[in-house]
């Protein structure tokens, strides 16, 4: 669906297999691992990307303090179960029947349990805080230039409308990008903030998911912005449920 017609590739996801077997000989692309058809005009969901990855060969000038309920993805990679729309299933289990509940970005939000564990609904991550530290530069970046450049980047590269970039904070060398998106705010065709954050994270790590597009070249008024570390915090509409022993 809406893949590049000429050479039948998926511009937004290199972890696909494409062939001209769609309606009227149109190029159609399927995600590795799941075999699900993907829309190559937009970002592929994080769940399908993780699945593909596992199947592949191996304004205030103050910074935001993440809330006590903010989650960091400490578990890393796993082979997720995705629903027919490509979203994470609320309950994830591994091959040894250890199960846990995840949020809409696939990050664990409960203690691990067994097959009896119930996850009633997929809880939406409505606020993502991307915390970056940039390499030393001659001087600080201009805050409004940095803000404009990041909004442009998220729109053009990740197709995320600027309305979902709630704020860009800057205290040299720390940059914080706040993404906010409630379920009700998403209109037809709007990219999910979780997917945009994941593509951005992979770009920053030099592991671009885009087909044949150069890596991320971030510049603010011509000055390269080189990131040396990234931390991403996820805030859910319903706080996570962990036992006290995890917190000690």
């Amino acid at each position: 669906h809406t893949a590049a017609q000429d050479n039948c590739t998926c511009p937004t996801n290199k972890m696909t297999v494409c062939s001209p077997d769609g309606p009227g000989g149109r190029c159609q692309c399927r995600a590795l691992g799941s075999g699900m058809a993907v829309d190559c005009s937009t970002l592929t969901s994080k769940c399908l990307l993780l699945k593909a990855r596992m199947s592949a060969p191996k304004n205030a000038r103050t910074l935001v303090r993440p809330s006590e309920h903010a989650l960091v993805d400490n578990d890393g990679l796993y082979d997720p179960d995705c629903d027919p729309e490509g979203r994470f299933k609320a309950r994830q289990c591994n091959q040894t029947s250890v199960c846990w509940c995840v949020n809409s970005v696939g990050v664990r939000r409960t203690d691990k349990g067994d097959l009896s564990l119930r996850c009633d609904e997929l809880v939406r991550t409505h606020h993502i805080l991307i915390d970056l530290r940039h390499r030393p530069t001659a001087g600080a970046f201009n805050h409004s230039d940095l803000d404009a450049e990041l909004r442009r980047l998220f729109r053009e590269r990740y197709r995320l409308h600027p309305k979902f970039v709630a704020a860009v904070h800057y205290e040299q060398p720390t940059i914080q990008i706040e993404l906010r998106q409630n379920t009700s705010q998403k209109a037809a065709g709007d990219v999910d903030i979780g997917d945009a954050a994941y593509y951005f994270e992979r770009d920053i790590k030099g592991e671009s998911l885009f087909q044949g597009r150069g890596g991320l070249d971030l510049r603010v008024r011509g000055e390269p912005l080189q990131v040396e570390r990234t931390l991403i915090y996820y805030l859910d509409e319903i706080p996570p449920k962990f036992s006290m022993k995890r917190l000690t």
Partner: antibody
Framework: QVQLVQSGAEVKKPGASVKVSCKAS????????MHWVRQAPGQGLEWMGE????????SYNQKFKGRVTITRDTSTSTAYMELSSLRSEDTAVYYC????????????WGQGTLVTVSS | DIQMTQSPSSLSASVGDRVTITCRAS??????LNWYQQKPGKAPKLLIY???SLHSGVPSRFSGSGSGTDFTLTISSLQPEDFATYFC??????????FGQGTKLEIK
């Protein structure tokens, strides 16, 4: 079927304001962007602004420098475009159009509202 | 703002002809290019979105291609109802979204 029905033609004096309505039916009003586009007589199309009906978020073409305001009433599935400080060059047909968040394509359009600015 | 330039601004053709209209963007817009048809006194109608995807109900004689800055709309075999004005529009970057100036397709 998707329908966007706009209010009738208006004649206004320079300096006045005009408010055009656009009533949507045949789809979930809050699930799509709504855009406003105008077309001066014999001219091309000019994008004016957009709104997400779910939360009322708007963005505008800076060309209109605060003269345009887009609002919505979700209870009646109606979007509104108000243009103030009218001048003769604002004489145009004003269209509302349903938009897609990714392609930013306008897949359904209202029939248009002719606004004539004349002293 | 991104400028969209269409060529030609007008052209004459006959029923059955193959017609091509081009649209050039002032900067790379990837594939986020849409085409509309407008008849006198009527609202525009979406023909093609994302460079080459046909909007529902649009005849298959219409096709689009291109990428980056150069795009084309092709009508493989002109029908009487195709005589109209055609506009391209980019939806790539931050607002404002911009249109080409239009190409008027007339009967020869």
């Amino acid at each position: 079927q998707v329908q966007l029905v706009q209010s009738g033609a208006e004649v206004k004096k320079p300096g006045a304001s005009v408010k055009v309505s656009c009533k949507a039916s045949g789809y979930t009003f809050t699930s799509y962007w709504m855009h406003w586009v105008r077309q001066a007589p014999g001219q091309g199309l000019e994008w004016m602004g957009e709104i997400t009906p779910s939360d009322g978020y708007t963005s505008y073409n800076q060309k209109f420098k605060g003269r345009v305001t887009i609002t919505r009433d979700t209870s009646t599935s109606t979007a509104y475009m108000e243009l103030s400080s009218l001048r003769s060059e604002d004489t145009a047909v004003y269209y509302c159009a349903r938009g897609h968040g990714n392609y930013v394509s306008f897949d359904y359009w209202g029939q248009g509202t002719l606004v004539t600015v004349s002293s | 703002d991104i400028q969209m330039t269409q060529s030609p601004s007008s052209l004459s053709a006959s029923v059955g002809d193959r017609v091509t209209i081009t649209c050039r963007a002032s900067q790379d817009i990837s594939n986020y290019l849409n085409w509309y048809q407008q008849k006198p006194g009527k609202a525009p109608k979406l023909l093609i979105y994302y460079t080459s995807s046909l909007h529902s109900g649009v005849p298959s004689r219409f096709s689009g291609s291109g990428s980056g800055t150069d795009f084309t709309l092709t009508i493989s075999s002109l029908q009487p109802e195709d005589f109209a004005t055609y506009f391209c529009q980019q939806g790539y970057t931050l607002p404002p979204y911009t249109f080409g100036q239009g190409t008027k397709l007339e009967i020869k």
